[in-house]
Protein backbone atom coordinates (compact mmCIF):
# COMPACT_ATOMS: atom_id res chain seq x y z
CA UNK A 1 0.00 0.00 0.00
CA UNK A 2 1.16 3.39 -1.05
CA UNK A 3 0.90 5.96 2.25
CA UNK A 4 -1.75 9.03 1.31
CA UNK A 5 0.70 11.83 1.05
CA UNK A 6 -0.66 15.42 -0.53
CA UNK A 7 0.88 16.16 -3.87
CA UNK A 8 3.53 18.21 -4.19
CA UNK A 9 2.68 21.90 -5.96
CA UNK A 10 2.82 22.17 -9.71
CA UNK A 11 2.69 18.47 -10.09
CA UNK A 12 -0.66 17.61 -10.16
CA UNK A 13 -1.66 15.61 -13.58
CA UNK A 14 -3.44 17.03 -16.20
CA UNK A 15 -3.11 14.22 -18.44
CA UNK A 16 -1.23 11.11 -18.66
CA UNK A 17 1.67 11.66 -20.05
CA UNK A 18 5.30 10.80 -20.45
CA UNK A 19 6.45 13.26 -17.36
CA UNK A 20 4.76 10.65 -15.09
CA UNK A 21 7.80 8.38 -15.64
CA UNK A 22 9.84 10.25 -13.08
CA UNK A 23 7.13 10.30 -10.52
CA UNK A 24 8.13 8.51 -7.19
CA UNK A 25 5.40 6.03 -6.62
CA UNK A 26 3.62 8.31 -3.77
CA UNK A 27 3.38 11.00 -6.23
CA UNK A 28 1.52 8.95 -9.07
CA UNK A 29 -0.48 7.95 -5.93
CA UNK A 30 -1.15 11.78 -4.94
CA UNK A 31 -1.19 13.52 -8.13
CA UNK A 32 -2.51 10.79 -10.52
CA UNK A 33 -6.57 11.18 -10.59
CA UNK A 34 -8.34 7.82 -10.74
CA UNK A 35 -10.67 8.93 -13.56
CA UNK A 36 -8.57 11.23 -14.99
CA UNK A 37 -6.43 7.80 -15.85
CA UNK A 38 -9.70 5.64 -16.75
CA UNK A 39 -10.55 7.56 -19.25
CA UNK A 40 -6.89 7.64 -20.58
CA UNK A 41 -6.05 4.05 -20.32
CA UNK A 42 -4.85 3.95 -23.94
CA UNK A 43 -2.01 6.37 -23.39
CA UNK A 44 -0.98 4.12 -20.51
CA UNK A 45 0.28 1.36 -22.73
CA UNK A 46 2.51 3.70 -24.30
CA UNK A 47 4.48 5.23 -21.36
CA UNK A 48 6.77 2.80 -20.09
CA UNK A 49 6.17 2.94 -16.52
CA UNK A 50 7.87 0.39 -14.73
CA UNK A 51 6.78 -2.60 -13.01
CA UNK A 52 6.98 -0.69 -9.56
CA UNK A 53 5.01 2.05 -10.87
CA UNK A 54 2.11 -0.10 -12.46
CA UNK A 55 1.52 -1.17 -8.80
CA UNK A 56 0.40 2.02 -8.26
CA UNK A 57 -2.12 2.52 -11.56
CA UNK A 58 -3.55 -0.87 -10.87
CA UNK A 59 -4.27 0.23 -7.20
CA UNK A 60 -6.27 3.36 -8.53
CA UNK A 61 -8.35 1.58 -10.96
CA UNK A 62 -9.01 -0.88 -8.17
CA UNK A 63 -10.73 2.04 -6.14
CA UNK A 64 -12.08 3.36 -8.85
CA UNK A 65 -14.09 -0.05 -9.84
CA UNK A 66 -14.23 -2.74 -6.94
CA UNK A 67 -16.63 -4.44 -9.11
CA UNK A 68 -13.65 -4.96 -12.04
CA UNK A 69 -13.27 -2.90 -14.62
CA UNK A 70 -15.18 -1.83 -17.27
CA UNK A 71 -14.34 -3.15 -21.13
CA UNK A 72 -13.35 0.09 -22.11
CA UNK A 73 -10.41 0.36 -19.40
CA UNK A 74 -9.78 -3.84 -19.79
CA UNK A 75 -8.98 -3.28 -23.72
CA UNK A 76 -6.22 -1.20 -23.01
CA UNK A 77 -4.88 -2.41 -19.95
CA UNK A 78 -1.27 -3.28 -21.85
CA UNK A 79 1.65 -4.25 -19.48
CA UNK A 80 -1.09 -3.60 -16.59
CA UNK A 81 -2.44 -6.93 -17.54
CA UNK A 82 0.67 -8.36 -15.81
CA UNK A 83 -0.60 -6.86 -12.60
CA UNK A 84 -3.95 -8.23 -12.76
CA UNK A 85 -4.37 -11.80 -10.28
CA UNK A 86 -6.88 -14.43 -11.72
CA UNK A 87 -9.45 -12.67 -8.91
CA UNK A 88 -9.11 -9.70 -10.42
CA UNK A 89 -9.78 -11.02 -14.18
CA UNK A 90 -12.94 -13.02 -12.49
CA UNK A 91 -14.96 -9.86 -12.34
CA UNK A 92 -14.13 -9.08 -15.79
CA UNK A 93 -16.74 -9.27 -18.28
CA UNK A 94 -14.61 -9.20 -21.88
CA UNK A 95 -17.01 -9.63 -24.74
CA UNK A 96 -14.71 -7.92 -27.35
CA UNK A 97 -12.36 -10.59 -29.40
CA UNK A 98 -10.28 -7.16 -30.12
CA UNK A 99 -9.94 -6.96 -26.22
CA UNK A 100 -8.67 -10.18 -25.60
CA UNK A 101 -6.03 -10.19 -28.40
CA UNK A 102 -5.12 -6.84 -27.11
CA UNK A 103 -4.05 -8.85 -23.75
CA UNK A 104 -2.72 -11.88 -25.04
CA UNK A 105 -0.26 -9.71 -27.23
CA UNK A 106 1.26 -8.33 -23.75
CA UNK A 107 1.98 -12.05 -22.49
CA UNK A 108 3.01 -13.51 -26.26
CA UNK A 109 6.15 -15.43 -25.60
CA UNK A 110 5.44 -16.61 -22.67
CA UNK A 111 3.64 -19.75 -21.05
CA UNK A 112 0.19 -19.63 -20.31
CA UNK A 113 -0.28 -18.04 -16.83
CA UNK A 114 -3.40 -18.32 -14.27
CA UNK A 115 -4.63 -14.75 -15.69
CA UNK A 116 -4.16 -15.69 -19.25
CA UNK A 117 -6.15 -19.10 -18.94
CA UNK A 118 -8.40 -16.87 -16.15
CA UNK A 119 -9.42 -14.88 -19.02
CA UNK A 120 -9.71 -16.78 -21.99
CA UNK A 121 -11.74 -18.96 -19.83
CA UNK A 122 -13.94 -15.78 -18.77
CA UNK A 123 -13.89 -14.87 -23.23
CA UNK A 124 -15.01 -18.34 -23.91
CA UNK A 125 -17.94 -18.95 -20.92
CA UNK A 126 -19.13 -15.41 -22.02
CA UNK A 127 -20.00 -16.50 -25.59
CA UNK A 128 -21.38 -20.08 -24.85
CA UNK A 129 -19.06 -21.49 -27.45
CA UNK A 130 -15.21 -22.03 -28.88
CA UNK A 131 -16.03 -20.14 -32.26
CA UNK A 132 -13.58 -20.49 -34.82
CA UNK A 133 -12.65 -16.70 -34.30
CA UNK A 134 -12.00 -17.28 -30.92
CA UNK A 135 -9.80 -20.48 -31.67
CA UNK A 136 -8.14 -19.14 -34.53
CA UNK A 137 -6.78 -16.45 -32.25
CA UNK A 138 -6.00 -18.74 -29.16
CA UNK A 139 -4.34 -21.20 -30.85
CA UNK A 140 -2.49 -18.61 -33.05
CA UNK A 141 -0.88 -17.70 -29.45
CA UNK A 142 -0.88 -20.86 -27.60
CA UNK A 143 -0.64 -23.51 -30.50
CA UNK A 144 -1.44 -26.20 -27.29
CA UNK A 145 -4.16 -24.25 -26.21
CA UNK A 146 -6.76 -27.06 -27.58
CA UNK A 147 -5.24 -29.77 -25.80
CA UNK A 148 -5.44 -27.94 -22.76
CA UNK A 149 -9.27 -28.27 -23.09
CA UNK A 150 -11.57 -30.95 -21.26
CA UNK A 151 -13.37 -33.11 -23.02
CA UNK A 152 -16.31 -31.77 -21.45
CA UNK A 153 -15.24 -28.64 -22.87
CA UNK A 154 -14.23 -29.44 -26.28
CA UNK A 155 -17.75 -31.12 -26.39
CA UNK A 156 -18.74 -26.89 -27.27
CA UNK A 157 -16.60 -26.42 -29.70
CA UNK A 158 -18.85 -26.41 -33.24
CA UNK A 159 -17.43 -28.08 -36.15
CA UNK A 160 -17.17 -25.02 -38.12
CA UNK A 161 -14.28 -24.09 -35.77
CA UNK A 162 -11.87 -27.43 -36.74
CA UNK A 163 -11.05 -25.32 -39.87
CA UNK A 164 -8.66 -22.89 -37.52
CA UNK A 165 -6.68 -26.13 -36.20
CA UNK A 166 -3.33 -26.62 -37.61
CA UNK A 167 -1.50 -29.97 -36.88
CA UNK A 168 0.63 -28.69 -34.30
CA UNK A 169 -2.27 -27.69 -31.97
CA UNK A 170 -3.08 -31.05 -31.35
CA UNK A 171 0.59 -32.12 -30.46
CA UNK A 172 -0.51 -32.91 -26.74
CA UNK A 173 -3.71 -33.74 -27.10
CA UNK A 174 -4.46 -37.72 -25.38
CA UNK A 175 -6.96 -39.99 -26.80
CA UNK A 176 -10.04 -39.07 -24.64
CA UNK A 177 -9.31 -35.40 -26.32
CA UNK A 178 -9.41 -36.63 -29.82
CA UNK A 179 -12.26 -38.65 -29.45
CA UNK A 180 -13.68 -35.57 -28.82
CA UNK A 181 -12.72 -34.01 -31.97
CA UNK A 182 -12.10 -36.36 -34.22
CA UNK A 183 -16.22 -36.87 -34.82
CA UNK A 184 -16.19 -32.72 -35.49
CA UNK A 185 -13.32 -32.96 -37.80
CA UNK A 186 -14.93 -35.77 -39.52
CA UNK A 187 -18.00 -33.97 -40.37
CA UNK A 188 -15.72 -30.35 -40.69
CA UNK A 189 -14.18 -32.11 -43.24
CA UNK A 190 -16.94 -34.36 -45.28
CA UNK A 191 -17.44 -32.67 -48.65
CA UNK A 192 -13.58 -32.79 -49.43
CA UNK A 193 -12.14 -35.17 -52.01
CA UNK A 194 -10.30 -38.52 -50.89
CA UNK A 195 -6.30 -36.95 -50.88
CA UNK A 196 -7.53 -33.34 -49.47
CA UNK A 197 -9.90 -35.30 -47.13
CA UNK A 198 -6.78 -37.76 -45.73
CA UNK A 199 -4.56 -33.99 -45.06
CA UNK A 200 -7.20 -32.28 -43.17
CA UNK A 201 -8.19 -35.30 -41.08
CA UNK A 202 -3.97 -37.09 -40.47
CA UNK A 203 -3.66 -35.11 -37.50
CA UNK A 204 -7.09 -35.66 -35.69
CA UNK A 205 -7.10 -39.51 -36.34
CA UNK A 206 -5.82 -40.50 -32.87
CA UNK A 207 -9.62 -40.39 -32.47
CA UNK A 208 -10.73 -42.26 -35.32
CA UNK A 209 -12.75 -46.09 -35.00
CA UNK A 210 -11.82 -48.87 -36.97
CA UNK A 211 -14.35 -48.63 -39.59
CA UNK A 212 -13.12 -45.71 -40.53
CA UNK A 213 -9.65 -46.68 -40.88
CA UNK A 214 -11.22 -49.74 -42.91
CA UNK A 215 -12.85 -47.50 -45.01
CA UNK A 216 -9.24 -45.15 -45.15
CA UNK A 217 -7.65 -48.16 -46.10
CA UNK A 218 -9.10 -48.61 -49.68
CA UNK A 219 -8.36 -45.12 -50.31
CA UNK A 220 -4.87 -45.66 -50.83
CA UNK A 221 -3.49 -42.94 -48.63
CA UNK A 222 -0.46 -44.53 -47.40
CA UNK A 223 -0.14 -43.25 -44.14
CA UNK A 224 3.01 -42.56 -42.01
CA UNK A 225 4.27 -44.69 -39.21
CA UNK A 226 4.21 -41.45 -37.15
CA UNK A 227 0.36 -41.07 -37.58
CA UNK A 228 -0.16 -45.00 -37.76
CA UNK A 229 1.90 -45.10 -34.03
CA UNK A 230 -1.24 -42.55 -32.45
CA UNK A 231 -4.10 -44.25 -33.11
CA UNK A 232 -6.06 -45.62 -30.82
CA UNK A 233 -4.93 -49.45 -30.01
CA UNK A 234 -8.54 -50.57 -29.68
CA UNK A 235 -9.43 -49.10 -33.22
CA UNK A 236 -5.69 -50.82 -34.48
CA UNK A 237 -6.31 -54.54 -33.27
CA UNK A 238 -9.29 -55.29 -35.90
CA UNK A 239 -7.82 -54.29 -38.63
CA UNK A 240 -6.26 -57.42 -40.96
CA UNK A 241 -3.34 -57.34 -42.19
CA UNK A 242 -3.99 -56.61 -45.51
CA UNK A 243 -5.86 -53.60 -44.34
CA UNK A 244 -3.14 -52.34 -42.92
CA UNK A 245 -0.55 -53.36 -45.21
CA UNK A 246 -3.40 -51.16 -47.80
CA UNK A 247 -3.44 -48.09 -45.20
CA UNK A 248 0.35 -47.74 -45.00
CA UNK A 249 0.92 -48.27 -48.47
CA UNK A 250 5.09 -47.78 -48.79
CA UNK A 251 5.50 -46.99 -45.14
CA UNK A 252 4.49 -50.28 -44.22
CA UNK A 253 8.21 -51.43 -44.30
CA UNK A 254 8.60 -48.96 -40.56
CA UNK A 255 6.47 -51.90 -39.02
CA UNK A 256 9.01 -53.81 -38.28
CA UNK A 257 11.26 -50.45 -36.52
CA UNK A 258 7.99 -50.11 -34.36
CA UNK A 259 7.17 -53.95 -33.45
CA UNK A 260 7.65 -53.57 -30.12
CA UNK A 261 5.51 -50.42 -29.29
CA UNK A 262 1.96 -50.24 -29.25
CA UNK A 263 -0.59 -50.16 -30.89
CA UNK A 264 2.16 -52.16 -33.52
CA UNK A 265 3.35 -54.94 -30.94
CA UNK A 266 -0.58 -55.68 -29.67
CA UNK A 267 -1.90 -55.69 -33.33
CA UNK A 268 0.87 -58.48 -33.99
CA UNK A 269 -0.15 -60.51 -31.06
CA UNK A 270 -3.68 -60.87 -32.30
CA UNK A 271 -2.29 -62.04 -36.30
CA UNK A 272 -2.02 -65.03 -38.03
CA UNK A 273 1.55 -65.57 -38.40
CA UNK A 274 1.33 -66.69 -42.00
CA UNK A 275 -0.40 -63.39 -42.72
CA UNK A 276 2.29 -61.52 -41.36
CA UNK A 277 4.74 -63.27 -43.04
CA UNK A 278 3.23 -61.98 -46.15
CA UNK A 279 4.27 -58.62 -45.65
CA UNK A 280 8.31 -60.21 -45.66
CA UNK A 281 9.41 -58.18 -42.78
CA UNK A 282 10.11 -60.48 -40.30
CA UNK A 283 7.43 -59.29 -38.13
CA UNK A 284 7.40 -62.16 -35.31
CA UNK A 285 4.87 -62.67 -32.47
CA UNK A 286 1.99 -63.44 -34.18
CA UNK A 287 -0.77 -66.43 -34.04
CA UNK A 288 1.25 -69.94 -35.02
CA UNK A 289 -0.60 -71.86 -37.99
CA UNK A 290 -3.14 -74.23 -36.75
CA UNK A 291 -4.35 -72.30 -33.72
CA UNK A 292 -8.02 -71.01 -33.04
CA UNK A 293 -8.62 -67.87 -32.19
CA UNK A 294 -11.46 -66.96 -30.20
CA UNK A 295 -13.43 -63.30 -29.71
CA UNK A 296 -14.21 -63.43 -25.82
CA UNK A 297 -15.29 -60.03 -26.07
CA UNK A 298 -18.30 -61.17 -29.21
CA UNK A 299 -18.73 -63.75 -26.91
CA UNK A 300 -19.47 -61.96 -24.05
CA UNK A 301 -21.79 -59.73 -25.75
CA UNK A 302 -23.91 -62.80 -26.72
CA UNK A 303 -24.64 -64.14 -23.52
CA UNK B 1 21.06 -11.94 -33.28
CA UNK B 2 20.38 -8.78 -32.54
CA UNK B 3 22.82 -6.27 -33.32
CA UNK B 4 23.99 -2.12 -32.71
CA UNK B 5 26.01 -0.69 -34.57
CA UNK B 6 27.56 3.12 -33.56
CA UNK B 7 29.64 5.28 -35.58
CA UNK B 8 33.18 5.84 -34.66
CA UNK B 9 34.83 7.82 -32.45
CA UNK B 10 34.68 11.87 -32.56
CA UNK B 11 37.18 14.44 -31.13
CA UNK B 12 34.96 17.82 -30.41
CA UNK B 13 35.53 21.56 -29.30
CA UNK B 14 33.72 22.68 -25.99
CA UNK B 15 30.03 24.63 -26.95
CA UNK B 16 29.91 22.33 -30.43
CA UNK B 17 27.97 19.08 -30.88
CA UNK B 18 28.30 15.61 -32.04
CA UNK B 19 25.68 12.91 -33.15
CA UNK B 20 26.02 9.53 -32.51
CA UNK B 21 24.44 7.10 -34.82
CA UNK B 22 22.96 3.20 -33.87
CA UNK B 23 22.02 1.46 -36.63
CA UNK B 24 19.97 -1.93 -35.30
CA UNK B 25 19.37 -5.33 -37.02
CA UNK B 26 18.27 -8.66 -35.71
CA UNK B 27 14.68 -7.29 -34.70
CA UNK B 28 11.75 -5.20 -35.59
CA UNK B 29 13.14 -1.81 -34.74
CA UNK B 30 9.87 -0.31 -34.36
CA UNK B 31 8.95 -2.34 -31.29
CA UNK B 32 11.48 -1.37 -28.93
CA UNK B 33 12.28 1.71 -26.99
CA UNK B 34 15.93 3.12 -27.68
CA UNK B 35 17.84 3.93 -24.94
CA UNK B 36 21.27 5.76 -24.65
CA UNK B 37 23.45 5.69 -21.67
CA UNK B 38 26.62 7.32 -21.14
CA UNK B 39 30.02 6.39 -19.10
CA UNK B 40 32.71 9.09 -18.67
CA UNK B 41 36.66 7.91 -18.41
CA UNK B 42 36.62 5.25 -15.45
CA UNK B 43 33.49 6.07 -14.08
CA UNK B 44 30.06 4.72 -13.81
CA UNK B 45 26.93 4.82 -15.97
CA UNK B 46 24.05 6.95 -16.35
CA UNK B 47 21.13 6.85 -18.18
CA UNK B 48 19.85 9.99 -20.71
CA UNK B 49 17.18 9.34 -21.82
CA UNK B 50 15.16 7.29 -25.03
CA UNK B 51 12.83 7.41 -28.13
CA UNK B 52 10.48 4.72 -29.65
CA UNK B 53 11.29 4.44 -33.11
CA UNK B 54 7.53 3.57 -33.51
CA UNK B 55 5.69 6.93 -32.25
CA UNK B 56 8.96 9.63 -32.30
CA UNK B 57 7.94 9.70 -28.45
CA UNK B 58 10.65 10.93 -26.31
CA UNK B 59 11.86 10.44 -22.84
CA UNK B 60 14.82 12.51 -21.68
CA UNK B 61 16.72 12.56 -18.53
CA UNK B 62 15.99 16.47 -16.78
CA UNK B 63 20.13 16.87 -16.45
CA UNK B 64 20.18 16.65 -20.58
CA UNK B 65 16.99 18.47 -21.37
CA UNK B 66 17.45 20.99 -23.71
CA UNK B 67 20.76 19.55 -24.64
CA UNK B 68 20.10 16.70 -26.46
CA UNK B 69 18.18 15.63 -29.00
CA UNK B 70 17.09 11.48 -30.12
CA UNK B 71 15.75 11.07 -33.44
CA UNK B 72 15.29 7.61 -35.81
CA UNK B 73 14.86 7.03 -39.44
CA UNK B 74 13.27 4.11 -39.74
CA UNK B 75 13.92 3.66 -43.21
CA UNK B 76 17.50 2.34 -42.25
CA UNK B 77 16.70 0.88 -38.55
CA UNK B 78 18.86 3.84 -37.16
CA UNK B 79 18.59 6.08 -33.78
CA UNK B 80 20.30 9.43 -33.44
CA UNK B 81 21.79 10.64 -30.29
CA UNK B 82 22.51 14.75 -30.42
CA UNK B 83 24.19 16.49 -27.66
CA UNK B 84 25.02 20.44 -27.76
CA UNK B 85 26.89 22.65 -25.83
CA UNK B 86 29.38 20.33 -25.29
CA UNK B 87 31.41 20.76 -22.01
CA UNK B 88 34.55 18.67 -20.96
CA UNK B 89 33.14 16.87 -18.43
CA UNK B 90 30.89 15.32 -21.59
CA UNK B 91 33.99 13.61 -22.27
CA UNK B 92 32.63 9.81 -22.48
CA UNK B 93 31.76 6.71 -24.35
CA UNK B 94 28.00 6.33 -24.82
CA UNK B 95 25.98 3.44 -25.96
CA UNK B 96 22.61 2.95 -27.22
CA UNK B 97 20.91 0.09 -25.56
CA UNK B 98 17.39 -1.69 -25.75
CA UNK B 99 15.48 -2.36 -23.17
CA UNK B 100 12.76 -5.76 -24.55
CA UNK B 101 9.88 -5.57 -22.00
CA UNK B 102 9.61 -1.74 -21.46
CA UNK B 103 8.04 -2.56 -17.52
CA UNK B 104 11.73 -3.92 -16.69
CA UNK B 105 14.11 -1.61 -17.72
CA UNK B 106 16.83 -3.54 -17.68
CA UNK B 107 19.39 -2.98 -20.91
CA UNK B 108 19.13 -6.20 -22.42
CA UNK B 109 21.04 -5.57 -25.45
CA UNK B 110 23.96 -3.05 -25.99
CA UNK B 111 25.72 -0.87 -28.94
CA UNK B 112 29.30 -1.02 -29.21
CA UNK B 113 29.98 2.55 -27.86
CA UNK B 114 31.10 5.71 -29.37
CA UNK B 115 33.53 7.52 -27.98
CA UNK B 116 33.45 11.33 -27.69
CA UNK B 117 36.17 13.56 -26.52
CA UNK B 118 35.40 16.93 -25.92
CA UNK B 119 38.74 19.35 -25.47
CA UNK B 120 39.91 22.34 -26.97
CA UNK C 1 16.70 10.14 -7.96
CA UNK C 2 17.50 6.71 -6.49
CA UNK C 3 21.48 6.41 -5.45
CA UNK C 4 22.88 3.11 -5.92
CA UNK C 5 25.99 2.55 -3.73
CA UNK C 6 28.32 -0.15 -4.69
CA UNK C 7 30.91 -1.78 -2.50
CA UNK C 8 33.71 -2.27 -2.24
CA UNK C 9 35.50 -0.11 -5.22
CA UNK C 10 37.87 -2.94 -6.15
CA UNK C 11 38.32 -6.71 -5.08
CA UNK C 12 41.28 -8.99 -5.81
CA UNK C 13 40.03 -12.59 -5.27
CA UNK C 14 42.01 -15.86 -5.80
CA UNK C 15 40.90 -18.26 -8.65
CA UNK C 16 38.41 -20.57 -7.56
CA UNK C 17 37.59 -18.48 -4.05
CA UNK C 18 34.27 -16.54 -3.98
CA UNK C 19 33.80 -13.13 -4.76
CA UNK C 20 30.81 -10.88 -3.20
CA UNK C 21 29.92 -7.42 -4.22
CA UNK C 22 27.34 -5.28 -2.25
CA UNK C 23 24.81 -2.26 -3.77
CA UNK C 24 22.88 -0.20 -1.15
CA UNK C 25 19.84 1.72 -3.01
CA UNK C 26 18.62 4.88 -1.09
CA UNK C 27 15.31 3.94 -1.68
CA UNK C 28 13.19 0.69 -1.22
CA UNK C 29 13.66 -0.36 -5.07
CA UNK C 30 11.61 -3.92 -4.36
CA UNK C 31 13.35 -6.39 -6.76
CA UNK C 32 13.62 -4.04 -9.51
CA UNK C 33 17.94 -4.55 -9.57
CA UNK C 34 19.72 -5.31 -12.72
CA UNK C 35 23.66 -6.99 -12.23
CA UNK C 36 26.01 -5.91 -15.39
CA UNK C 37 29.77 -7.23 -16.23
CA UNK C 38 31.72 -5.06 -18.16
CA UNK C 39 35.09 -6.19 -19.58
CA UNK C 40 37.71 -3.89 -20.90
CA UNK C 41 37.35 -2.15 -24.30
CA UNK C 42 33.61 -3.77 -24.07
CA UNK C 43 30.17 -2.79 -23.57
CA UNK C 44 28.36 -4.06 -20.65
CA UNK C 45 26.73 -7.42 -20.50
CA UNK C 46 23.40 -8.02 -18.48
CA UNK C 47 24.08 -10.94 -16.01
CA UNK C 48 21.04 -11.09 -13.46
CA UNK C 49 17.82 -9.01 -13.31
CA UNK C 50 15.10 -9.23 -10.74
CA UNK C 51 17.98 -8.89 -8.24
CA UNK C 52 18.24 -12.79 -8.78
CA UNK C 53 17.15 -14.28 -11.89
CA UNK C 54 20.13 -15.18 -13.88
CA UNK C 55 19.88 -13.92 -17.72
CA UNK C 56 19.96 -16.31 -20.44
CA UNK C 57 23.59 -18.10 -20.71
CA UNK C 58 25.05 -16.74 -17.31
CA UNK C 59 27.00 -19.56 -15.40
CA UNK C 60 25.18 -20.93 -12.70
CA UNK C 61 28.32 -19.65 -10.35
CA UNK C 62 26.89 -16.05 -10.44
CA UNK C 63 24.08 -15.53 -8.19
CA UNK C 64 22.06 -12.22 -6.98
CA UNK C 65 20.40 -11.78 -3.83
CA UNK C 66 18.33 -9.00 -2.14
CA UNK C 67 15.47 -6.97 -1.67
CA UNK C 68 14.48 -3.63 -0.51
CA UNK C 69 18.14 -1.70 -0.04
CA UNK C 70 20.41 -4.63 0.17
CA UNK C 71 21.66 -5.79 -2.84
CA UNK C 72 24.61 -8.74 -3.77
CA UNK C 73 26.09 -10.25 -6.32
CA UNK C 74 28.11 -13.44 -5.60
CA UNK C 75 30.53 -15.15 -7.39
CA UNK C 76 31.26 -18.51 -5.86
CA UNK C 77 34.36 -19.71 -7.54
CA UNK C 78 36.06 -17.16 -9.72
CA UNK C 79 37.49 -18.01 -13.06
CA UNK C 80 39.72 -15.92 -15.65
CA UNK C 81 37.43 -14.66 -17.56
CA UNK C 82 35.00 -13.16 -14.81
CA UNK C 83 38.03 -10.28 -14.61
CA UNK C 84 36.16 -7.46 -15.03
CA UNK C 85 34.01 -4.42 -13.72
CA UNK C 86 30.42 -5.26 -12.48
CA UNK C 87 27.69 -2.74 -11.87
CA UNK C 88 24.50 -2.53 -10.25
CA UNK C 89 21.26 -1.26 -11.52
CA UNK C 90 17.92 -0.10 -10.28
CA UNK C 91 14.76 -0.22 -12.18
CA UNK C 92 11.84 0.72 -10.01
CA UNK C 93 11.87 4.40 -11.17
CA UNK C 94 13.05 6.67 -13.55
CA UNK C 95 15.91 8.22 -14.10
CA UNK C 96 17.49 4.97 -14.23
CA UNK C 97 20.60 4.73 -11.95
CA UNK C 98 23.61 2.64 -11.80
CA UNK C 99 26.07 1.96 -8.97
CA UNK C 100 29.63 3.55 -9.94
CA UNK C 101 31.15 -0.02 -10.18
CA UNK C 102 33.26 -2.73 -8.72
CA UNK C 103 36.42 -3.64 -10.26
CA UNK C 104 37.69 -7.54 -9.91
CA UNK C 105 41.11 -9.08 -10.67
CA UNK C 106 42.68 -12.18 -9.59
CA UNK C 107 44.59 -11.94 -6.49
Known amino acids: EVEKTACPSGKKAREIDESLIFYKKWELEACVDAALLATQMDRVNAIPFTYEQLDVLKHKLDELYPQGYPESVIQHLGYLFLKMSPEDIRKWNVTSLETLKALLEVNKGHEMSPQVATLIDRFVKGRGQLDKDTLDTLTAFYPGYLCSLSPEELSSVPPSSIWAVRPQDLDTCDPRQLDVLYPKARLAFQNMNGSEYFVKIQSFLGGAPTEDLKALSQQNVSMDLATFMKLRTDAVLPLTVAEVQKLLGPHVEGLKAEERHRPVRDWILRQRQDDLDTLGLGLQGGIPNGYLVLDLSMQEALS | QVQLVQSGAEVKKPGASVKVSCKAS????????MHWVRQAPGQGLEWMGM????????IYYEKFQGRVTMTVDKSISTAYMELSRLRSDDTAVYYC?????????????WGQGTLVTVSS | DIVMTQSPDSLAVSLGERATINCKAS??????VAWYQQKPGQSPKLLIY???TRHTGVPDRFTGSGSGTDFTLTISSLQAEDVAVYFC?????????FGAGTKLEIK
Open chain 2, 51 to 58: IHPNSDNT
Open chain 2, 97 to 109: AIIITPVVPKFDY
Open chain 3, 50 to 52: WAS
Open chain 3, 27 to 32: HDVGTS
Open chain 3, 89 to 97: QQYSSYPLT
Open chain 2, 26 to 33: GYTFTSYW
